[in-house]
């Protein structure tokens, strides 16, 4: 058992153009609050699926009114952490949905209006007991900065909160299914793995793979109450001390209600009282409808008139995801050819072409030599997206306009002397050497 904790640091307009100044208007003040939904494993973060690890709702933040003309401040946030308790092992990998809700405060008579402002989702690996992890997520034009961690509640410890630890000072007899704790303070050993299906409430083991029953229970998995007819109670095993029935397994044993729902027995079965935001026989459904505005970035919500029917977001170009919350990285498809630079402007793609190329996708190879003359008898050579001049002897530079000193590079070997000549260069070789460059 343990607690997942979420700390919201800031919520506001993200970087870049087109970001809203504020979620509130000067006409209608508002305040923000947050809802977090956790699911085990790297499951799809569909908002409709149940928050099997739990959910939490923050308090409402301070009232905020936009001041026209004033610089946009950080939006005031609710105080405190969002805490999601978990009863079983921490899964290590989990999916989250964090919703930012706006409560618009109308006049006294009209009351507030609630609307979903942004929803971010993600999948993460996280060991319990570790430090705070920081994250930044964007939903459309909004940016949410937050930190999170999972911590175990004593006596659970370990990265999954599955190791149970009893301090040395505690009584040495550990509970059923637990090995005695190690001698050092707060060190402990993992519970034995009993036979698969062995009742966690009524069975225990002292050797791996066995299933021994507590008093009043029987069967290979300790799920069958020992029957007795001497008492009035309709079910349950007999107590060795009283001879009377003690409560046995009821329909609420193990709490069939998900997402923090509370179970109450009924004459025929059980009934779950669900926390806010959940419904269904076992509180397994989280209802989000088109009325909640789940489609971001101008997505069109279809269906989902009520929480029983799923909604579908039809995303505008450039966005994807079940809520149109993900911007498509259109540049990842490398649409610009010939080494062009891709720019995703949001409403359109632009390619910045290298010299010598043109077109929306830099697909046209320009005639690099068109309109370009090489001086002093040089000839233009096309290629590589830029023109190049092959210059006549005695000339150099980009357009062959510079007079070149052919002797500057000291081309004559073995001490030969270089003379510039209208047709090139001539080497006068030192005694004993010959060849155009005195190389022999």
């Amino acid at each position: 058992a343990g607690v997942f904790e979420l700390q919201i640091h800031s919520f506001g307009p993200g970087p870049g153009p087109g970001a809203p100044r504020s979620p509130c208007s000067a006409r209608l003040p508002c305040r923000l609050f947050f809802r977090v939904c956790l699911k085990p494993g790297l499951s799809e973060e569909a908002a409709e699926s149940p928050c099997a690890l739990g959910a939490a709702l923050s308090a409402r933040g301070p009232v905020y009114t936009e001041q026209p003309g004033a610089p946009a401040p950080d939006l005031p946030l609710p105080d405190g952490l969002l805490q999601v308790p978990f009863r079983d092992a921490w899964p290590g990998t989990f999916s989250f949905i964090i919703e930012t809700w706006r409560e618009e405060l109308g006049d006294q008579i009209g009351g507030p209006a609630w609307s979903l402002l942004a929803r971010v989702a993600g999948r993460r690996r996280l060991a319990a007991g570790g430090p705070w992890a920081r994250d930044i997520q964007r939903a459309g034009a909004w940016e949410l900065r937050f930190s999170y961690r999972a911590r175990c509640e004593p006596p659970a410890v370990g990265t999954a909160c599955t190791r149970l630890c009893r301090p040395r000072s505690a009584p040495s007899r550990c509970g059923p299914g637990l090995r005695p704790c190690a001698p050092l303070e707060d060190e402990c050993e993992a519970p034995l793995v009993c036979r698969a299906g062995c009742s966690p409430e009524h069975g225990f083991c002292e050797q791996p793979g066995e299933c021994r029953c507590l008093e009043g229970w029987t069967g290979p998995l300790c799920t069958v109450p020992v029957s007795t007819s001497s008492c009035l109670s309709p079910r349950g095993p007999s107590s060795a001390t009283t001879g009377c029935l003690v409560p046995g397994p009821g329909p609420c044993d193990g709490n069939p209600c998900a997402n923090g729902g509370s179970c109450s027995e009924t004459p025929r079965s059980f009934e779950c009282t669900c926390p806010r935001g959940f419904y269904g026989l076992r509180c397994e459904v989280s209802g989000v409808t088109c009325a909640d505005g789940p489609c971001f970035n101008g997505g069109l919500c279809v269906g989902g008139a009520d929480p029983d029917s799923a909604y579908i977001c039809h995303c505008p170009p450039g966005f994807q995801g079940s809520n149109c919350e993900k911007r498509v990285d259109r540049c990842s498809l490398q649409p610009c050819r010939n080494g062009g630079l891709c720019l995703d402007l949001g409403h359109a793609l632009r390619c910045r072409c290298r010299a010598g190329f043109a077109g929306p996708r830099c697909e046209h190879d320009l005639d690099d030599c068109a309109g370009r003359a090489c001086a002093n008898g040089g000839t233009c050579v096309e290629g590589g997206g830029a023109h190049r001049c092959s210059c006549a002897l005695g000339f150099g530079g980009r357009d062959c306009r510079e007079r070149a000193d052919p002797c500057a590079a000291r081309p004559c070997a073995h001490g030969g002397r270089c003379y510039a000549h209208f047709s090139g260069l001539v080497c006068a070789c030192a005694p004993g050497y010959m060849g155009a460059r005195c190389e022999f």
Partner: nanobody
Framework: QVKLVESGGGSVQAGGSLRLSCAAS????????MAWFRQAPGKEREGVAC????????YYADSVKGRFTISQDNAKNTVYLQVNSLKPEDTAMYYC????????????????WGQGTQVTVSS
């Protein structure tokens, strides 16, 4: 399509209590704004209390604050209005409404309405 049916109204003495119920069928009540309105003869319909069932957020008219409590039971698909310390001026037909994108006490914003249940408070 949501069908809303109110019940629990009746005649009581001033200072008495009632529990009004709004049972929804055809859809679940979860994750939507719902409200109780009332209309006395010759008067306009006024908002009494509202709740966002997905969030548990509530709001009350000043005239009923501290006396009325709105709540929900998702398992029963029902929204309740517990009315205590009733006064003669609380006499009205009480209506339940669901689904609004506008401020939750604005009657014109709601899509679904029940037929109402009468509350009469005598002095």
């Amino acid at each position: 399509q949501v069908k809303l049916v109110e019940s629990g109204g009746g005649s009581v003495q001033a200072g008495g209590s009632l529990r009004l119920s709004c049972a929804a069928s055809g859809s679940t009540i979860s994750s939507r704004p719902m409200a109780w309105f009332r209309q006395a003869p010759g008067k306009e319909r006024e908002g009494v209390a509202c709740i966002h069932t997905g969030l548990g957020r509530t709001y009350y008219a000043d005239s009923v604050k501290g006396r009325f409590t709105i709540s929900q039971d998702n398992a029963k698909n029902t929204v309740y209005l517990q009315v205590n310390s009733l006064k003669p001026e609380d006499t009205a037909m009480y209506y339940c409404a669901a689904d609004s994108r506008r401020p939750c006490m604005v009657a014109a914003g709601y899509t679904y309405w029940g037929q109402g249940t009468q509350v009469t408070v005598s002095s």
